[in-house]
């Protein structure tokens, strides 16, 4: 088995739909607003959760927030960026009681937090702790950091082909 | 403080074989991916082996795999890296390297042990 | 496997210069993109990962950039300590891979 997972070709970092307040940090908004309804032939793979164009896959194992990075990635995927109130909503309507790794952490040196897109975030994050670098959603109805050696289950985001 | 020291390096002949250790101190070990990273006589950086926390996932490159094995004690707090069927271009120093928090680069590097081939 | 194609592979810089390194990767390696200094006789040491985000401790006068394929590293204001090789890396795929090294040397 391999740590350093293959990515699709076709992987590309989460973009945000339409234009959201921005404590989401959204990193370059669509002209066209917010995509609402399922468009003919968008697919996501078994399993996985579709919302506004993009597919979502909530896993039930846990592990780290790298192997979970990894992990997304093996999916041709990323760790959820959620820089859109409506996504959070939608995330927070199907996760268990249960905590899931998304793709936000927290950078020492210039003490912020950053979606693994590079964009800012910067809205609230709970739980902060000198050694809590990464954050969390499902188990509140808040981003919650984290430490990212413990094991949580994942968010990955994708495109919906 | 974190502190990775190599040891095990020396000169092997063509074909032969070797086990470099890492002692590691100053982190929790257990909780972090550990690499091996090997600088060749031209300065150029190649990774050689990784493993994840608790050893069940390994990663090696098509240059190495099948002579090259990486293994870790966390109890022992250390990072191993057994060489076999050894070539020329296996000549190198190599570093014991700790992964970042947020992705496979490397924020902590060994003072490194050198692997000399000879034919 | 992807190639991080580094340029220059040498720089001459004098104290007070800006110095700019580019790396371009063969594909798409969105934001996975480390940096790191090598002065004469140490190991690497990390100065920017993520692309563009300073690792702890690493002076401002360091910054990177970039997105996909195209990286750029830029010394603000060259110091005499900061004579070193250079490499880049991407962790976006496996293998893991390095550019060849940018080497600064004084004019």
């Known amino acids: 088995p391999q740590i350093f997972n293959k990515s699709n070709d076709g992987f590309t970092t989460t973009r945000s739909y339409g234009t959201v307040s921005q404590i989401f940090g959204s990193s370059s908004p669509s002209p066209n607003g917010f995509i609402t309804t399922r468009s003919y032939g968008t697919v996501c793979p078994k399993d996985w959760e579709f919302y506004q164009a993009r597919c979502f896959f909530l896993s039930t194992s846990e592990s780290s927030w790298n192997e979970s990075r990894d992990f997304c990635k093996g999916k041709g995927s990323t760790l959820a960026i959620v820089n859109t109130p409506e996504k959070l909503k939608f995330l927070q309507d199907i996760t268990d009681a249960e905590k899931y790794f998304i793709g936000l952490i927290y950078h020492r040196e210039e003490k912020r937090w950053r979606w693994i897109n590079n964009s800012v975030f910067n809205g609230n994050v709970t739980n902060q702790n000198q050694n809590f670098n990464c954050a969390t959603i499902g188990l509140t109805k808040t981003f919650d950091a984290a430490s990212c050696d413990i094991s949580y289950r994942r968010i990955c985001e994708k495109n919906a082909k | 403080d974190v502190k990775l020291v190599e040891s095990g390096g020396g000169l092997v002949k063509l074909g032969g074989s070797l086990k470099l250790s890492c002692a590691a101190s100053?982190?929790?070990?257990?909780?972090?991916?550990m690499s091996w990273v090997r600088q060749t006589p031209d300065k150029r950086l190649e990774l050689v082996a990784a493993?994840?926390?608790?050893?069940?996932?390994?990663y090696y490159p098509d240059t190495v795999k099948g002579r090259f094995t990486i293994s870790r004690d966390n109890a022992k707090n250390t990072l191993y890296l057994q060489m076999s069927s050894l070539k020329p271009e296996d000549t190198a120093l190599f570093y014991c390297?700790?992964?970042?928090?947020?992705?496979?680069?490397?924020?902590?590097w060994g003072q490194g042990t050198t692997l000399t081939v000879s034919s | 496997s992807i190639v991080m194609t580094q340029t220059p592979k040498f720089l001459l810089v004098s104290a007070g210069d800006r110095v700019t390194i580019t790396c371009k990767a063969s594909?798409?390696?969105?934001?996975?993109v480390a940096w790191y200094q090598q002065k004469p006789g140490q190991s690497p040491k990390l100065l920017i990962y993520?692309?563009?985000n300073r690792y702890t401790g690493v002076p401002d006068r360091f910054t990177g950039s970039g997105y996909g394929t195209d990286f750029t590293f830029t010394i603000s204001t060259v110091q005499a300590e900061d004579l070193a090789v250079y490499f880049c890396?991407?962790?976006?795929?496996?293998?893991?891979?390095f550019g060849a090294g940018t080497k600064l040397e004084l004019k």
């Open positions: 390297v700790r992964d970042g928090e947020f992705g496979h680069y490397f924020d902590y």
């Open positions: 100053g982190f929790t070990f257990s909780s972090y991916y």
């Open positions: 493993i994840n926390s608790n050893g069940g996932t390994t």
């Open positions: 594909q798409s390696v969105n934001n996975d």
């Open positions: 993520y692309a563009s």
């Open positions: 890396q991407q962790d976006y795929n496996s293998p893991l891979t």
